[in-house]
Amino acid sequence: VPDKTVRWCAVSEHEATKCQSFRDHMKSVIPSDGPSVACVKKASYLDCIRAIAANEADAVTLDAGLVYDAYLAPNNLKPVVAEFYGSKEDPQTFYYAVAVVKKDSGFQMNQLRGKKSCHTGLGRSAGWNIPIGLLYCDLPEPRKPLEKAVANFFSGSCAPCADGTDFPQLCQLCPGCGCSTLNQYFGYSGAFKCLKDGAGDVAFVKHSTIFENLANKADRDQYELLCLDNTRKPVDEYKDCHLAQVPSHTVVARSMGGKEDLIWELLNQAQEHFGKDKSKEFQLFSSPHGKDLLFKDSAHGFLKVPPRMDAKMYLGYEYVTAIRNLREGTCPEAPTDECKPVKWCALSHHERLKCDEWSVNSVGKIECVSAETTEDCIAKIMNGEADAMSLDGGFVYIAGKCGLVPVLAENYNKSDNCEDTPEAGYFAIAVVKKSASDLTWDNLKGKKSCHTAVGRTAGWNIPMGLLYNKINHCRFDEFFSEGCAPGSKKDSSLCKLCMGSGLNLCEPNNKEGYYGYTGAFRCLVEKGDVAFVKHQTVPQNTGGKNPDPWAKNLNEKDYELLCLDGTRKPVEEYANCHLARAPNHAVVTRKDKEACVHKILRQQQHLFGSNVTDCSGNFCLFRSETKDLLFRDDTVCLAKLHDRNTYEKYLGEEYVKAVGNLRKCSTSSLLEACTFRRP
């Protein structure tokens, strides 16, 4: 019988008492085969973290700073359940740390040196740790003691709880630096008052502070937020302009064998029975013998943290950067105006080898990082392990939802002004063998399908989106008799046709021979009835253009396109017979890397782009013998996006809507994780 006990860790006598009450009340409402609570008492949160890691306890609720400690080796804990605040309809699991300034003050984030600063309190998250952590490498050396470095960075501050004797500048704006509400500039409202009164130039608070202190929109409009990209935004645009997004209070567990489903089952049932306004005799979110015992008193309930979410992703790149800077105190030696090497994310061995070749030829400008799937690469870019990669539109959507931005677009048509003119896109098509003359768009049910990969534009999002509109359900594996759609569940009929061996079968990378445009077309040639690819795929792999044994004798005339009106047309008539227009593949990165990725890639394409005439004697960035490694092989150049510099603007309203509609069919664990952070 599986052990269904969750050992909760308590850090005080009062918490232990509440835990026992929790245990007893749960026993009274949950059947004997359901989850149960046991209580383990430790002296501190850090002891609880160690106990969970050592399998002496299973769960504890932590503030963001401790979630970071819990994630670090050797603890390796992960977030599993989040407390939420506000309403069930609009649950808030995060707050945003922001930098508020007066509208007419005219400076940016990178011009804070010499300004006067207002902080909620020394060592507090939004008011100190996050802003000072992010500014850490701009502080004058020596950076220890930190208070002295901060005092020398700003021209005056109010940092309640600081030592006014040792660091008088930190108390210049609030004599005495009192550590309670007796100090008019203490806490969130106090720090904002410090700005409002004109004592300081910037206040480091949380996003809700300004709304709580200024009910009137006209008053709020006198203030702005400083963004990390050295722009400003109105105060209500905090989701797009903050220093960090911080989880409020989170249950953590072991990453491996951590009972996360059991913990959720327990807490979900607990909130049903003992949540807000549920029971008089025991209340989960109330602490008669103290404050915030086990859970925050202000919490309204729990939400399950998506399983794909590790602590780094949950805490977010900015928060992790800030805390790591403060803890480790290390800064790059390079001057900050110089670009560091761009870490390119490569999928599987084939891409890594080409990336390494690029890295050697780039003379230190490009480094390579490997991942097994596109989603793993996106996650690595999010958390700073990698910086950039080129993505199909379907993944540009996911990357965008995860906070990444497009920076350059692949262009596929030769033109005089290639780099300045991003194209409208390419065509997604459905290809069949000419010999299967009875096959049309209207009778695909029961046929064998070939897809570039799940989540990609031409191979999945467009055809499956159109199909969904027809069949109104997501069981595409039942619609087709079998197929190869790399990235599907391994036991799905949509992995049946795939050719990868062993663990590589149906993997969404080049280890699966039927992956990508060329792979999907090969799948059609060898096994399938229909392939969903781009309009250039057939000509690029026929007429001897692909020397591989399976392709070298193929003829374009032996294939036709399926049109949405039920007719068929020759391959070259794609402009009048396609499923939809698809946005070109684009390079994505984090916002903080945007300028450097843009600069370095433009240099790299001038060295190794399509101006290189002899690819047998020189490295060519956009060539890989029809395997589309790192970039599509038909890329002519990487083009500037001009104002299409967000994923929504780049992909266009129509495509974003189409992918949004298909979201209910999404199997993307990363998309689920990212929409948890930003619904």
């Epitope: 390494d356 890295s359 050697v360 780039s362 003379v363």
Partner: nanobody, 112 residues
Framework: QVKLEESGGGLVQAGGSLRLSCVAS????????VIWYRQAPGKQRELVAL???????NYRESVRGRFTISRDDAKNTVWLQMNALEPEDTGVYYC??????FGQGTQVTVSS
């Protein structure tokens, strides 16, 4: 101006071994890494193995486990140890470092 010279090729039976060397004249050799390529008759030149300045190595899949690339910066030399050779390994082998033109290469022939 750095020049590269490859040697160590020859005729060998399938299953045999060869050790190729790439020697550079001039300074600054291999600061950014060295790549071994090969070209079989009528085929495109393909990357075989590479070694970066920090000692990181990578190989094309078909040679992984059979070939080993190594370097000795003091001797301005990069080696390619080739074991369990197969007929498909036949071709002219070249070493390359950024900014330096290809040398003459060294012919490797593997007979079955």
């Amino acid at each position: 101006q750095v020049k590269l010279e490859e040697s160590g090729g020859g005729l060998v039976q399938a299953g045999g071994s060869l050790r190729l060397s790439c020697v550079a004249s001039g300074s600054g050799f291999g600061i950014n890494g060295v790549i071994w390529y090969r070209q079989a008759p009528g085929k495109q030149r393909e990357l075989v193995a590479l070694i970066k300045s920090d000692g990181y190595t990578n190989y094309r899949e078909s040679v992984r486990g059979r070939f080993t690339i190594s370097r000795d910066d003091a001797k301005n030399t990069v080696w390619l140890q080739m074991n369990a050779l197969e007929p498909e390994d036949t071709g002219v082998y070249y070493c390359k470092t950024p900014g330096v033109p290809f040398g003459q290469g060294t012919q490797v022939t593997v007979s079955s």
